[in-house]
Amino acid sequence: MMTGTIETTGNISAEKGGSIILQCHLSSTTAQVTQVNWEQQDQLLAICNADLGWHISPSFKDRVAPGPGLGLTLQSLTVNDTGEYFCIYHTYPDGTYTGRIFLEVLESSVAEHGARFQIP
């Protein structure tokens, strides 16, 4: 039975041209994390494999940096980066946990971070 929960940075906003850290955290389970995939609307951004380390998609190397931790840093943000991002935790023996983050990239300096929330 899957008992864990994914805590994410939730709904967040950032300024065009700036950077943002996407963070997820798996809690309430003793399952071993074997891999974390980061996706943006079905496009792979990066993989962090427990044995092999980070794979940054060649399509995004100029704008994506690994970390901190299992998180992902998006750089040189554009309005087109607005949308849903998913952290997909592959664990043993539980299986797969998915967290969702919605990022809004704003033209001006009114960007504010949203509250954290949990996805069971």
């Epitope: 995939n37 792979l44 993989i47 092999l52 980070w54 940054i56 060649p58 190397k61 100029d62 690994p66």
Partner: antibody, heavy 118, light 113 residues
Framework: QVQLVQSGAEVKKPGASVKVSCKAS????????ILWIRQAPGQGLEWMGD????????NYNEKLQGRVTLTADTSSSTAYMELRSLRSDDTAVYYC???????????WGQGTLVTVSS | DIVMTQSPLSLPVTPGEPASISCRSS????????????LAWYLQKPGQSPQLLIY???TGESGVPDRFSGSGSGTDFTLKISRVEAEDVGVYYC?????????FGQGTKVEIK
């Protein structure tokens, strides 16, 4: 030990399709990308595309104009490359190779010769 | 697309002597986040599949003789063979795996004089 074993040589007519298989062993198939590279007779190496069996993510070389499809069967640890609407200039040796992020293409299949001739 | 340019295209060598191959990319292959260059070198011996020699521009693949070494950063890279042996003949390719589409140099044919 790590091995990538490809299917045998094929002779096809122009306009036909070919499907080449690549059976992986000796490692966790879903952890690594499978890339497909081709080499025309006496020529250099060309990247065709890649697939990640652990998530079925795919990337393709736009020069192939949508004629190629990469698939993977995790139950048999086998990757497939299908090329459609074959032309004479598709005559080449087709290689599958293993890859992950920083480490480049560290193991290669033995190659599959595909000859396109009328 | 990133264009990879090798020189020379043909390299006659004498066994026991050093050899050097140059590779230039049309844009930087240095990933700032880890300060690694996504550049690999391969050797394709006659009638065989290519084999990986060097990745990250300068890291030798396991099992590759230490007479092979890679250097360079950004857009200019070099593969050196400290003392060529007869078994080193074949075509050497550099390849960038920084961005799609992955691209290769034209190849350098190394043959014994």
């Amino acid at each position: 030990q790590v091995q990538l074993v490809q299917s045998g040589a094929e002779v096809k007519k122009p306009g036909a399709s070919v499907k080449v298989s690549c059976k992986a062993s000796g490692y966790t198939f879903t952890n690594y990308w499978i890339l497909w590279i081709r080499q025309a007779p006496g020529q250099g190496l060309e990247w065709m595309g890649d697939i990640y069996p652990g998530g079925h993510y795919t990337n393709y070389n736009e020069k192939l104009q949508g004629r190629v499809t990469l698939t993977a069967d995790t139950s048999s640890s086998t990757a497939y490359m299908e090329l459609r609407s074959l032309r004479s200039d598709d005559t080449a040796v087709y290689y599958c190779t293993r890859y992950y992020g920083p480490y480049a293409m560290d193991y290669w299949g033995q190659g599959t010769l595909v000859t396109v001739s009328s | 697309d990133i264009v990879m340019t090798q020189s020379p295209l043909s390299l006659p060598v004498t066994p026991g002597e050093p050899a050097s191959i140059s590779c230039r990319s049309s844009q930087s292959l240095l990933y700032n986040s880890n300060q690694k260059n996504y550049l690999a070198w391969y050797l394709q011996k006659p009638g065989q599949s290519p084999q990986l020699l060097i990745y990250w521009a300068s890291t030798g693949e396991s099992g590759v003789p230490d007479r092979f070494s890679g250097s360079g950063s950004g857009t200019d890279f070099t593969l050196k063979i400290s003392r060529v042996e007869a078994e080193d003949v074949g075509v050497y390719y550099c390849q960038q795996y920084y961005s799609y589409p992955f691209t290769f140099g034209q190849g350098t044919k190394v043959e014994i004089k």
